[in-house]
């Protein structure tokens, strides 16, 4: 039950995280015009990964896409790449984890396969979250650098083409959304990996050998628990608490009426 809950929660947390990463990637407010200690403007500038926008005091908002690919800073391209990789990995991870969910039965899929898929999706979520956090952090670092450069009257816009001395940019809402979303995806991935350990079936072979002491009906079963080698082992699902203590593999064991588990 705890494993199912951990897996389900990991899935939901990762889902929210990936939705957040997608939202952050699409948002226009990665950097916003710094209003502190600046002249009061009738124009509010903000920029995203794909376009830059202006909100006029008249109420109108106009955005302009970065129609050049080669003219953009390499760092911006790197951030785009990291966010896209994060989204792609996260999306694949979600797809895999849906089939890995313990509460969903697909044909005769064994727990070992589900454990493998859970681990795979968990790793994908972890990498996805790390990509998002890295992307947002690179952009934030770029902003900090440009902020001080612009203070020295050297700042050019994210497009890198037009000299606009008066506009300094600071952290936008998308950065915080990205950090939180990346963190959630990372946490979700860790939870999936933890759930995977619980999903991996433990090879518990109760090989029923009866020793009948005279006058006593005491069953002694050697062997105990065989430690599972993990989610990669070829262990099959063992029915342990069967009336006759038979495993699916050992249909030819002959229990006596004195055998207890």
């Amino acid at each position: 039950m705890a494993v199912t809950a951990c897996q389900g929660l990991g899935f939901v947390v990762s889902l929210i995280g990936i939705a957040g990463i997608i939202a952050a990637t699409c948002m226009d407010q990665w950097s916003t015009q710094d209003l502190y200690n600046n002249p009061v403007t009738a124009v509010f500038n903000y920029q995203g990964l794909w376009r830059s926008c202006v909100r006029e005091s008249s109420g109108f908002t106009e955005c302009r896409g970065y129609f050049t690919l080669l003219g953009l800073p390499a760092m911006l391209q790197a951030v785009r790449a990291l966010m896209i990789v994060g989204i792609v990995l996260g999306a694949i991870g979600l797809l895999v984890s849906i089939f890995a969910l313990k509460c969903i039965r697909i044909g005769s899929m064994e727990d070992s396969a589900k454990a493998n898929m859970t681990l795979t999706s968990g790793i994908m979520f972890i990498v996805s979250g790390l990509c998002a956090i890295a992307g947002v952090s690179v952009f934030a670092n770029m902003l900090v650098t440009n902020f001080w450069m612009s203070t020295a009257n050297m700042y050019t816009g994210m497009g890198g083409m037009v000299q606009t001395v008066q506009t300094r940019y600071t952290f936008g809402a998308a950065l915080f959304v990205g950090w939180v979303a990346g963190g959630l995806t990372l946490i979700g991935g860790v939870m999936m990996c933890i759930a995977c350990r619980g999903l991996a079936p433990e090879e518990t072979n109760y090989k029923a050998v009866s020793y009948h002491a005279s006058g006593h009906s005491v069953a002694y079963k050697p062997g105990g628990f065989k430690a599972s080698t993990g989610f990669g082992s070829n262990t099959k699902n063992k029915k342990i608490y069967d009336g006759g203590a038979r495993t699916e593999d050992e249909v030819q064991s002959y229990p006596s009426k004195h055998d207890y588990v």
Epitope: P39, G59, E62, T164
Partner: antibody, heavy 117, light 113 residues
Amino acid sequence: EVQLVESGGGLVQPGGSLRLSCAGSGITLSTYAMSWVRQAPGKGLEWVSSIISGGITYYLDSVKGRFTISRDNAKNTLYLQMSSLRAEDTAVYYCARKYHGNALDYWGQGTLVTVSS
Amino acid sequence: DIVMTQSPDSLAVSLGERATINCKSSQSLLSSGNQRNYLTWYQQKPGQPPKKLIYWASTRESGVPDRFSGSGSGTDFTLTISSLQAEDLAVYYCQNNYFYPLTFGQGTKLEIK
């Protein structure tokens, strides 16, 4: 047809108060950023104040603390409350709508405010 | 405050001739967000309120004759009337629409030579 009609101007003594109104027809003033611009006799245009969405207001430094821009959405009217009036406030006051590019596209005919003893 | 300086203060041009009015701002009016210049040109005839001619430095207002054109970027802007008509005689103002206060130029009076 969009029309802006200013009223409330007149002769007032220095230190006195006046409230200018700008009534809109064919336009819902509350949905637009609005401005007051003045023009002293024989002089150029001077922006005085603006009110934008959310009721955020901006003022020319020389009128800050003396003038207050506001609007009554129910009456579809823009106001400019002027107090502690000075001789240099004498001008024709226009109300205008801010549009694309923060440019003022619709203007009223203006109302004359004369501050004199 | 941003200072808008128009030149010349007055301009006498023959009908059918080209008229050019310049406007210089003390700070760049170019927005990095949309690459537009926040400068507007107005025409004011005696006894009338101003009329918007050009906004975003070069975008002509609908209904304005195409003999009016605006150009320039950053701090230097120009209003050009390609072929002066009698009805174009007026005072022309440029306005900064980027920074508060939204300052106007001192005006250029256009007259017939």
